[in-house]
């Protein structure tokens, strides 16, 4: 049999070998496709199937606009002028070239030694699904699961049957000061079809700088709270990626999961003390915040700390 590749929406003509070019003709076309459950023999007189597969006067079969459901096998059996039976067999596959792939949400720059999302490559409207590949400085990037990570997603449109592909690239650049160029290409995997390429993106790789200072914010302001109240400590740090934050009370680490926020609900005197946070950056080691003091006092023991307000939002009078 012969393999035929047809573009979705385009007409396709399959010739019936051996068939006389004009009637009278003895021929039979049958098909087994996504529109049939078994073999369907087409009526030479034509009929409801003519909209998808019609026998032409010369014996050829016309598919006016091939679709995904037309993939399958087409066979013609004809008797030639000398009375010999001639068979034709076609295996039809269809394809659709998507729009040019695009890199969406591209990074503005990369940081050395840490994972960075480069961007997401998107291709819409392909059939069959095809594949997306990433390139670094013109060379194919092979994901290794460590320094180069690719997260892929394929979706099929419920009505058209066409595919949308998404590929998210994350890399860990080894050193700063370089300017790598990333691009993405889509390939249908069909012979004689060149891949479609995105516009390349060139990114600067910077060395990870030390965090620009670390601040410990306390709520209520001043760190003075009545028994049963709530204290919120927030470790504010401007570093990318966000570091792990641990907490220290009176010089001893608190056995808590890393978090930039420490919540002390229903405080009692046992919660009094000096608190600080420690930010651990992958490439810069730990950095500790200035400490803050938490005091638990009955309302009225002392006036409110300077700048603090009562619950009503007004200063309280002893």
């Amino acid at each position: 049999g012969q393999n035929i590749t047809a573009r979705i929406g385009e007409p396709l003509v399959l010739s019936c070998k051996g068939a006389p070019k004009k009637p009278p003709q003895q021929l039979e076309w049958k098909l087994n496709t996504g529109r049939t459950e078994a073999w369907k023999v087409l009526s030479p007189q034509g009929g409801p199937w003519d909209s998808v597969a019609r026998i032409l006067p010369n014996g050829s079969l016309l598919l006016p606009a091939t679709g995904i459901v037309d993939e399958g096998t087409f066979r013609c059996r004809a008797t030639n002028r000398r009375g010999k039976e001639v068979k034709s067999n076609y295996r039809v596959r269809v394809y659709q070239i998507p729009g040019k792939p695009e890199i969406v949400d591209p990074a503005s720059e990369l940081t050395a030694s840490v994972p960075n999302k480069v961007g997401t490559c998107v291709s819409e409207g392909s059939y069959p699904a095809g594949t997306l590949s990433w390139h670094l400085d013109g060379k194919l990037l092979i994901p290794d699961g460590k320094e180069t990570l690719v997260k892929e997603e394929t979706r099929r449109h419920p009505e058209t049957g066409l595919f949308t592909l998404r590929s998210e690239l994350t890399v860990i650049p080894t050193q700063g000061g370089t300017h790598p160029t990333f691009s993405c290409s889509f390939s249908l995997g069909l012979p004689r079809r060149r891949p479609l390429n995105t516009a390349p993106i060139q990114l600067r790789v910077r060395e990870p700088g030390p965090p620009e200072g670390i601040q410990l914010l306390v709520e209520p302001e001043g760190g003075i709270v009545a028994p049963g109240g709530t204290v919120t400590l927030t470790c504010a740090i401007s570093a990318q990626p966000p570091p792990q934050v641990h907490w220290i009370k009176d010089g001893a680490p608190l056995p808590l999961a890393p978090s930039p926020v420490l919540l002390l609900p229903e405080v009692g005197h046992e919660d009094e003390g000096t608190y600080s946070c420690v930010a651990t950056h992958p490439s810069h080691g730990p950095q500790e915040s200035p400490p803050v003091s938490i005091r638990v006092t009955e309302t009225g023991d002392e006036g409110p700390a300077e700048g603090s307000v009562g619950e009503s939002g007004l200063g309280t009078l002893a």
Epitope: E37, S43, Q45, P48, W49, D50, S51, R54
Partner: antibody, heavy 119, light 107 residues
Framework: EVQLVESGGGLVQPGSSLRLSCAAS????????MTWVRQAPGKGLEWVAS????????YYPDSVKDRFTISRDNAKNSLYLQMNSLRAEDTAVYYC????????????WGQGTLVTVSS | DIQMTQSPSSLSASVGDRVTITCRAS??????VNWFQQKPGKAPRRLIY???NLADGVPSRFSGSRSGTDFTLTISSLQPEDFATYYC?????????FGGGTKVEIK
């Protein structure tokens, strides 16, 4: 909203001719095959004619072949049925319907127009 | 030509009943069968397309099934507005052929 409106029915004598029209709206007319179906008083439905979306190919059952001609004007979104040599057994309500091929079957129908053939 | 033998030709049922109508094709027509509902003086309305698919705006109490050349329309719980005549249609071959119809009447 898909709409099909038939016109042209009436009382005619056996042997005479009549032309039915169907005005289509609410869809891309030239994307669809179109079909005429009839229903004799108190009887079931009977296929009369179909035409492909371009108008190049027409299809009829033996009962009307050579007497009826289906045609269309895609520029006017209109379907026609020219009925010649009318017989008493052609008396029926004639419906215009969208489709007629395997991709659609028959999905939307007009309200019909009555053709009475009687002397 | 293909024959579509529809049964029963009429039936009496009560509101809430489950109703089943069958069409048998004289040869293989694949999935290319529609079901229609027709009320007196009105045009047919498509209920089911390609044997098993519910048409837009049709209540889910209607369903279509197929076993080889046997096609079935089921109304799971008959409603007052469902009393009408029902037809099947094969559109796999010309001539397009309708079943003879089933009139569903109030018991």
């Amino acid at each position: 909203e898909v709409q099909l409106v038939e016109s042209g029915g009436g009382l005619v004598q056996p042997g005479s001719s009549l032309r039915l029209s169907c005005a289509a709206s609410g869809f891309t007319f030239n994307n669809y095959w179109m079909t005429w179906v009839r229903q004799a008083p108190g009887k079931g439905l009977e296929w009369v004619a179909s035409i492909d979306n371009s108008g190049d190919n027409t299809y009829y059952p033996d009962s009307v072949k050579d007497r009826f001609t289906i045609s269309r004007d895609n520029a006017k979104n209109s379907l026609y049925l020219q009925m010649n040599s009318l017989r008493a057994e052609d008396t029926a309500v004639y419906y215009c319907a969208r489709g007629g091929d395997i991709t659609t079957g028959l999905d939307y129908w007009g309200q019909g127009t009555l053709v009475t053939v009687s002397s | 030509d293909i024959q579509m033998t529809q049964s029963p030709s009429s039936l009496s049922a009560s509101v809430g009943d489950r109703v089943t109508i069958t069409c048998r094709a004289s040869q293989d027509v694949g999935i290319y069968v529609n079901w229609f509902q027709q009320k007196p003086g009105k045009a047919p309305r498509r209920l089911i397309y390609r044997a098993t698919n519910l048409a837009d705006g049709v209540p889910s109490r209607f369903s279509g099934s197929r076993s080889g050349t046997d096609f079935t329309l089921t109304i799971s719980s008959l409603q007052p507005e469902d009393f009408a005549t029902y037809y099947c249609l094969e559109f796999d071959e010309h001539p397009l052929t309708f079943g003879g119809g089933t009139k569903v009447e109030i018991k």
